[in-house]
């Protein structure tokens, strides 16, 4: 069986997971891309996806998940803002390519969210949690529903997941809270 690797991200409640998924530019630039969670005994569940065809650097927000597809750089940026303990789990980034199977973009992400130092996880006003300004977004729908596949079966390419530098929209309170550890199943 193919050994699937995981990258472990440890973050505090209220922080932002920021992952970049590389893809082959010429092949997949306009393909629809998705962020999925994998739970034990469950099929991968699509939590959010880009439009079809995917638009260049056009943020799509579904709840606390923001996807941005940068065609010029061949990468999908996935952010989960205001993290909560229940967000902990195993995630993956995929490209839809019907009628073929979705294509996994990078090693799976093992997200571990722990309670922060702040006593009130829900409010940013008086805590050291993330300050996040929501960018203009394109859709409130999870995915355009005429796009079909959902499950991932291919072996993943080498991971290119990384922690991005905080910018004007995302302010991580403590970037050293992020630990990346390759984990082998």
């Amino acid at each position: 069986a193919t050994k699937l690797t995981e990258e472990k991200y440890e973050l505090k409640e209220g922080q932002t997971l920021d992952v970049k998924c590389d893809y082959t530019l010429e092949k997949f630039a306009s393909s629809q891309k998705a962020w999925q969670i994998i739970r034990d005994g469950e099929m991968p569940k699509t939590l959010a996806c880009t439009e079809r065809p995917s638009k260049n650097s056009h943020p799509v927000q579904v709840g606390r998940i923001i996807l941005e597809d940068y065609h010029d750089h061949g990468l999908l940026r996935v952010r989960m803002v205001n993290l909560q303990v229940e967000d902990s789990g195993l995630y993956q980034c995929v490209i839809y390519q019907p009628p073929k199977e979705p294509h996994m973009l990078f090693d799976r992400i093992r997200l571990v969210v722990t309670k922060g130092f702040s006593g009130t996880p829900g409010s940013n006003e008086n805590s050291t949690q993330n300050v996040y300004k929501i960018p203009p977004t394109t859709t409130k729908a999870l995915c355009p529903l005429y796009t079909s596949p959902r499950t991932v079966t291919q072996a993943p390419p080498k991971s290119t997941a990384d922690v991005s530098t905080p910018d004007s929209e995302i302010n991580l309170t403590n970037v050293t809270d992020i630990i990346r550890v390759p984990v082998f199943n």
């Epitope: 969670i37 739970r39 005994g41 469950e42 099929m43 991968p44 569940k45 699509t46 939590l47 959010a48 996806c49 579904v62 709840g63 606390r64 998940i65 989960m80 909560q84 229940e86 967000d87 019907p98 009628p99 199977e101 999870l142 995915c143 529903l145 796009t147 079909s148 596949p149 959902r150 499950t151 991932v152 079966t153």
Partner: antibody, heavy 118, light 113 residues
Framework: EVQLVESGGGLVKPGGSLRLSCAAS????????MNWVRQAPGKGLEWVSS????????YYADSVKGRFTISRDNAKNSLYLQMNSLRAEDTAVYYC???????????WGQGTMVTVSS | DIVMTQSPDSLAVSLGERATINCKSS????????????LAWYQQKPGQPPKLLIY???TRESGVPDRFSGSGSGTDFTLTISSLQAEDVAVYYC?????????FGGGTKVEIK
């Protein structure tokens, strides 16, 4: 037109076997996860089994685990349910249903009746 | 397993009146990160297969009349038919599709008073 058509139902004795088929048309079958759902006469709906688009993920309800086998042939646009060791309580209309990307069951077949009786 | 409890079992409503069906799940079907409730409503007329009406608890399926609406979040959900029509006579089921095994409510039979 998007369509699912079940076949293979009928009358079978307890302990017997049946193989249900579901023929899909009007959509890219190989891209969708599929399901079997059953409904006993005068009763509600019960999920039976699910299979992912390329058969990598397969799940069953506890009530049929070890007796039923779900499979698919994407080249033939077909979904199957092999039912062994049938019991009276398996008597039901069996529907195949398509799973959409949001995970709801958006397209259902007309159903095929399975009667288990001696 | 998530248990889905529907109420009432049956409902008789006059034509043009409002029909309200409730569904309660034994645990939350709200996915916090994308703020989606993995709950659907289906309509089943006699001798026919179920038909998807509402998904994500409140999003109407394409082609479904706007007199049908879904609401609620977490564990408590409602299907409302704002003005009952003769063709709405059917059994209505809620379903959670958050966790396997996917489970349905017991159904609510809607009839004309």
């Amino acid at each position: 037109e998007v369509q699912l058509v079940e076949s293979g139902g009928g009358l079978v004795k307890p302990g017997g076997s049946l193989r249900l088929s579901c023929a899909a048309s009007g959509f890219t079958f190989s891209s969708y996860s599929m399901n079997w759902v059953r409904q006993a006469p005068g009763k509600g709906l019960e999920w039976v089994s699910s299979i992912s688009s390329s058969s990598s993920y397969i799940y069953y309800a506890d009530s049929v685990k070890g007796r039923f086998t779900i499979s698919r042939d994407n080249a033939k646009n077909s979904l199957y349910l092999q039912m062994n060791s049938l019991r009276a309580e398996d008597t039901a209309v069996y529907y195949c249903a398509r799973t959409r990307i949001d995970d709801s069951f958006d397209i259902w077949g007309q159903g095929t009746m399975v009667t288990v009786s001696s | 397993d998530i248990v889905m409890t529907q109420s009432p079992d049956s409902l008789a409503v006059s034509l043009g009146e409002r029909a309200t069906i409730n569904c309660k799940s034994s645990q939350s079907v709200l996915f916090s990160s994308n703020n989606k409730n993995y709950l659907a409503w289906y309509q089943q007329k006699p001798g026919q297969p179920p038909k998807l009406l509402i998904y994500w608890a409140s999003t109407r399926e394409s082609g479904v009349p706007d007199r049908f609406s879904g609401s609620g979040s977490g564990t408590d959900f409602t299907l409302t038919i704002s003005s009952l029509q003769a063709e709405d006579v059917a059994v209505y089921y809620c379903q959670q599709y958050d966790l396997l095994p996917y489970t349905f409510g017991g159904g609510t039979k809607v009839e004309i008073k």
